[in-house]
């Protein structure tokens, strides 16, 4: 049977093609450097096809490779702004099962206002991901500024 | 029938697997503050397979998922030279039709030479990406400086 | 047969899912800019499916157009090192066969103290990508913050 | 074969107006950024400034922003360089130069330059 | 501004000579070093870009080294025709700045 018709056939989450991208709800309360994510078609361009959110933070469905994204604009800021309140760092990374508990993507701001970056690694199902953001800067919340995907790769 | 065989008997495109990797052609004309794009085999390592270029911009021919990259150098640079011509900002977005017009990507370039980032984006059959670089300065037309590509994710 | 049983008929590779994703073993002795990498589960998140390590450079085993993409932060960086020491480049690029050598993808550092992109390019079966990083400045061996990888998105 | 030629160079008072054209040929004018740069005679180089191929994009030197604007007629193949306010240390002969196709600021084409000279 | 500092201002040196020119700049400017050859009357001529590669249609006794802050340009056995001022140019931070160049002059 040919992949054309097994894509009509098969509910496309049975393929693996899990994919996530999220737009910034809020920022945590104090001490809780964690961003806060929200996604689906009445928000806008974001969405979520396999994984979930949790509270604002994006748990895996499915076992795989995943490849995991993210933009951070910081709202209110210039060059002067970031090196004064320096260092301003924003981490991804597994916060849940504690067991699995790991920093995968860290990135700091130093003169400039956005972080983007990219990278492949082994998800599980059950895995939590958090996105840590120190500092006292607040990030923007504009869709086009500031974002956070996943999209699987193989199994 | 195995999917390896299908691959053999399928054109690519039926697979969903469309994918465009661009090189910069020229900036616009005043007032115009788009980029305007070229790729195919004959100008280097840029290529388009299922989008089309009109008129310097991408078209998108198939609806489904993209993950949109872009890198933009700017030609003659340094922290001094980005933060004395602030704000050069580039956006991508969708252009046209009017109707979808959106920002899907944007950053500045604050004390830095390079701007690189990424996202995850449904996009329409008919959709055209636009890149708007703000600002006087030229960016590189070096090929490993300067790019903008999209890849089909997942219907 | 559905693509879901071809998954598990199939091994991954002869489905074209060629992926790496490496961590920093070590920098070049002096002359000679190459990051050398290293990859696999006993490393902890780094892995290679289809491509190999050559001498601690990532040698390609299928045709394709690949998704490359690296993160580089400095070890003993500030804004001030970086313009201090700057620039450090970092540039990506196909080092063997000589007759296929070119730069694929090229970042200064500025005054920041990470650099992050991607990109789609063709790759070759034998293909050895290098990445070199010029001027005076370490790399961050912390596998979340310095990593370098490939994607295969079709043939 | 490439081909740059300035002209509209001459004397004037301070204070005064100059336009200088630089016609081009033997290559596609409109693919690629074109600058201005001047040398007092006997004494170095000194970049005035920049216009991206299409026209829409211009930066200036410091000493010459505000006073002197770069444009250019790709329907004609012609570079502009209109010099308003001039001054005594705007003397110099004025080279036009085109970038390297990369946009990148070297220049790997000149033409011969045309004398600005600017005294009462 | 980036300062671009030539050595010497000035040489002499006969044909067949090994000739170098050194050029400083003020600030670590990477590759982005390019030499020029301009003759009395004439308009400057692009010998060498990005520090080290040879302009087309430019004889190979010409060459650049150098990356940061450090660079020359040798002439590996000087000729008739290459007797002119040379100057160096970062490409690098805006604006463009040049050497106050070196002229090489018969011995």
């Known amino acids: 049977q040919r992949f054309a018709q097994a894509q009509q056939q098969l509910p496309l989450e049975s393929l693996g093609w899990d994919v996530a991208e999220l737009q910034l709800n809020h920022t945590g309360p104090q001490q809780d450097p964690r961003l806060y994510w929200q996604g689906g078609p009445a928000l806008g361009r974001s969405f979520l096809h396999g994984p979930e959110l949790d509270k604002g933070q994006l748990r895996i469905h499915r076992d795989g490779i995943y490849m995991v994204h993210i933009q951070v604009t910081l709202a209110i800021c210039s060059s002067t702004t970031a090196s004064r309140h320096h260092p301003t760092t924003l981490a991804v990374g597994i916060c849940s099962p504690a067991s699995r508990s790991i920093s995968l993507l860290r990135l700091s701001f130093h003169q400039g206002c956005t972080i983007a970056s990219q990278r492949l690694t082994p998800l599980a199902r059950g895995d939590t991901l958090c996105t840590n953001l120190t500092g006292t800067l607040l990030p923007s919340r504009n869709t086009d500024e500031t974002f956070f995907g996943v999209q699987w790769v193989r199994p | 029938q195995r999917f390896a065989q299908a691959q053999q008997q399928l054109p690519l495109e039926s697979l969903g697997w469309d994918v465009a990797e661009l090189q910069l052609n020229h900036t616009g004309p005043q007032q115009d503050p788009r980029l305007y794009w070229q790729g195919g085999p004959a100008l280097g390592r840029s290529f388009l397979h299922g989008p089309e270029l009109d008129k310097g911009q991408l078209r998108i021919h198939r609806d489904g998922i993209y993950m949109v990259h872009i890198q933009v150098t700017l030609a003659i640079c340094s922290s001094t030279t980005a933060s004395r011509h602030h704000p050069t900002t580039l956006a991508v977005g969708i252009c046209s039709p009017a109707s979808r017009s959106i920002s899907l990507l944007r950053l500045s370039f604050h004390q830095g030479c390079t701007i690189a980032s990424q996202r995850l984006t449904p996009l329409a059959r008919g959709d055209t990406l636009c890149t708007n670089l703000t600002g006087t300065l030229l960016p590189s037309r070096n090929t490993d400086e300067t790019f903008f590509g999209v890849q089909w994710v997942r219907p | 047969q559905r693509f879901a049983q071809a998954q598990q008929q199939l091994p991954l590779e002869s489905l074209g899912w060629d992926v790496a994703e490496l961590q920093l073993n070590h920098t070049g002795p002096q002359q000679d800019p190459r990051l050398y990498w290293q990859g696999g589960p006993a490393l902890g998140r780094s892995f290679l499916h289809g491509p190999e390590l050559d001498k601690g450079q990532l040698r390609i085993h299928r045709d394709g157009i690949y998704m490359v993409h690296i993160q580089v932060t400095l070890a003993i960086c500030s804004s001030t090192t970086a313009s201090r020491h700057h620039p450090t480049t970092l540039a990506v690029g196909i080092c063997s066969p000589a007759s296929r050598s070119i730069s694929l993808l090229r970042l200064s550092f500025h005054q920041g103290c990470t650099i992050a992109s991607q990109r789609l390019t063709p790759l070759a079966r034998g293909d050895t990508l290098c990445t070199n990083l010029t001027g005076t400045l370490l790399p961050s061996r912390n596998t979340d913050e310095t990593f370098f990888g490939v994607q295969w998105v079709r043939p | 074969e490439v081909q740059l030629l300035e002209s509209g160079g001459g004397l004037v008072q301070p204070g005064g107006s100059l336009r200088l054209s630089c016609a081009a040929s033997g290559f596609t004018f409109s693919s690629y950024a074109m600058s201005w740069v001047r040398q007092v005679p006997g004494k170095g180089l000194e970049w005035v400034s920049v216009i991206s191929g299409s026209g829409g994009r211009t930066d200036y030197a410091d000493s010459v922003k505000g006073r002197f604007t770069i444009s250019r007629d790709n329907s004609k193949n012609t570079l502009y360089l209109q010099m308003n306010s001039l001054r005594a240390e705007d003397t110099a002969v004025y080279y036009c130069?085109?970038?390297?196709?990369?946009?990148?600021?070297?220049?790997?084409?000149w033409g011969q330059g045309t004398l600005v000279t600017v005294s009462s | 501004d980036i300062q671009m500092t030539q050595s010497p201002s000035s040489l002499s040196a006969s044909v067949g000579d090994r000739v170098s020119i050194t050029c400083r700049a003020s600030q670590s400017i990477s590759s982005y070093l390019n030499w020029y050859q301009q003759k009395p009357g004439k308009a400057p001529k692009l010998l060498i870009y990005a520090a080290s590669s040879l302009q087309s249609g430019v004889p190979s006794r010409f060459s650049g080294s150098g990356s940061g802050t450090d660079f020359t340009l040798t002439i590996s056995s000087l000729q008739p025709e290459d007797f002119a001022t040379y100057y160096c140019q970062q490409s690098y931070s805006a604006p463009p700045t040049f050497g106050g160049g070196t002229k090489v002059e018969i011995k």
């Open positions: 130069a085109r970038h390297d196709y990369s946009n990148r600021f070297y220049f790997d084409y």
